[in-house]
């Protein structure tokens, strides 16, 4: 009899999510009878966020009652496989990666939520979820078909300090420019109106009706 399990996980993700509880129940009940292997399911494709963070769920149908599980994320590129991160956890406890690991994760039953941080465009590739039931014996190995993670580097964004310096420089420049402009304008005006200018007051004809016998003075500059 063929080994019943998750074949290539190419179904739409929403469909996989909807049918998963039933599938998991089926495997938990029947795998010990049909197949002495562990099967691991993970999404086919994930797009990393603009901050270089990618998250995906790794689920496994366990053929045994393990108390100690090891989860490893592998990256496959050009048939070369490298370890990205690994964590061992006791069932019911939290998944803990090493402090310097680029991975974080949480576990819930036979499901592990994995997050990989610090990804760049060059890190685009196939990320394989490997699950090992370490204890008690027998040991079981489960390898997922991999999640293709696409990472797109954002346009280089200058940091806030740099922006502040630019803003300060532009503001200062504008201030000095306006100050200079004002100074030049004032100096031109002052040159036009010399302090030695003399003039005479003359009586002008009335601008108001005849009844008002008032005269308006008018200053006439004499060059």
């Amino acid at each position: 009899m063929a080994c019943l399990g998750f074949q290539r996980h190419k179904a739409q993700l929403n469909l996989a999510t909807r049918t998963w509880p039933c599938t998991l129940l089926f495997f938990l009940l029947f795998i010990p009878v049909f197949c002495k292997a562990m099967h691991v399911a993970q999404p086919a494709v994930v797009l990393a966020s603009s901050r270089g963070i990618a998250s995906f769920v790794c689920e496994y149908a366990s053929p045994g009652k393990a108390t100690e599980v090891r989860v490893t994320v592998l990256r496959q590129a050009d048939s070369q496989v490298t370890e990205v991160c690994a964590a061992t956890y006791m069932m019911g406890n939290e998944l803990t990666f090493l402090d310097d690991s680029i991975c974080t994760g949480t576990s819930s039953g036979n499901q592990v939520n994995l997050t990989i941080q610090g990804l760049r465009a060059m890190d685009t590739g196939l990320y394989i979820c490997k699950v090992e039931l370490m204890y008690p014996p027998p040991y079981y190995l489960g390898i997922g078909n991999g999640t293709q993670i696409y990472v797109i580097d954002p346009e280089p964004c200058p940091d806030s300090d740099f922006l502040l310096w630019i803003l300060a420089a532009v503001s200062s420049g504008l201030f000095f420019y306006s100050f200079l402009l004002t100074a030049v304008s004032l100096s031109k005006m002052l040159k036009k109106r010399s302090p030695l200018t003399t003039g005479v007051y003359v009586k002008m004809p009335p601008t108001e009706p005849e009844c008002e016998k008032q005269f308006q003075p008018y200053f006439i500059p004499i060059n």
């Epitope: 080994c3 592998l74 204890y135």
Partner: antibody
């Protein structure tokens, strides 16, 4: 260069003990499961034992359980197999092998011969 | 324990011929966890195929693996003089790790 080199084999009387060593180089030792596999003269391959990563988990073949102990020293990049209460049927070439990240035995040592004879 | 049975025990062929080796499991093995090894006299085994069909690093493309469930096959498309050796299949999905008894490919 990834390499495994076994040592410690020899001729020993039934009921006696022997310790095999396997020195590893060229890879991150603690990231891999390490196995001992043996091959009796003119026979096929038989898996003997495995030790995982930090050494906290070990599994043995039924034929050696209770007599053989697998251990590792990650600081020295060395794998060991302590063989007690040896029997004539334990006569074989003993290989250490590194499990690949995807599970198969991708790197093997050259082997060391253990002969149990009175 | 998963028992692997290889056939034939010995295969007598000439260089340039096609070799087909069979490995049958006592119970279903996921194709992700089946490997093939080559062993020459006085040497350690060498990994040829893992995951039933993926060639290991440096293995020529005349070697190919296939199969699923309980039946697996190793095919050598054109035998070269250096291919005459003993071939073992192995399952590594669960403990105990088990090997087939081997198929010897000899020169006719």
């Amino acid at each position: 260069q990834v390499q495994l080199v076994e040592s410690g084999g020899g001729v020993v009387q039934p009921g006696r003990s022997l310790r095999l060593s396997c020195a590893a180089s060229g890879f991150t030792f603690s990231s891999y499961g390490l196995h001992w596999v043996r091959q009796a003269p003119g026979k096929g391959l038989e898996w003997v034992a495995v030790i995982w990563y930090d050494g906290s988990n070990k599994h043995y073949a039924d034929s050696v359980k209770g007599r053989f102990t697998i251990s590792r020293d990650n600081a020295k990049n060395t794998l060991y197999l302590q063989m007690n209460s040896l029997r004539a049927e334990d006569t074989a070439v003993y290989y250490c092998a590194r499990g690949a990240l995807l599970g198969a035995f991708e790197i093997w040592g050259q082997g060391t011969m253990v002969t149990v004879s009175s | 324990e998963i028992v692997l049975t290889q056939s034939p025990g010995t295969l007598s062929l000439s260089p340039g011929e096609r070799a087909t080796l069979s490995c049958r499991a006592s119970q279903s093995v996921s194709s992700s966890y089946l490997a093939w090894y080559q062993q020459k006299p006085g040497q350690a085994p060498r990994l040829l195929i893992y995951g039933a069909s993926s060639r290991a690093t440096g293995i020529p493309d005349r070697f190919s693996g296939s199969g699923s469930g309980t039946d697996f096959t190793l095919t050598i498309s054109r035998l070269e003089p250096e291919d005459f050796a003993v071939y073992y299949c192995q399952q590594y999905g669960s403990s105990p790790w088990t090997f087939g008894q081997g198929t010897k490919v000899e020169i006719k």
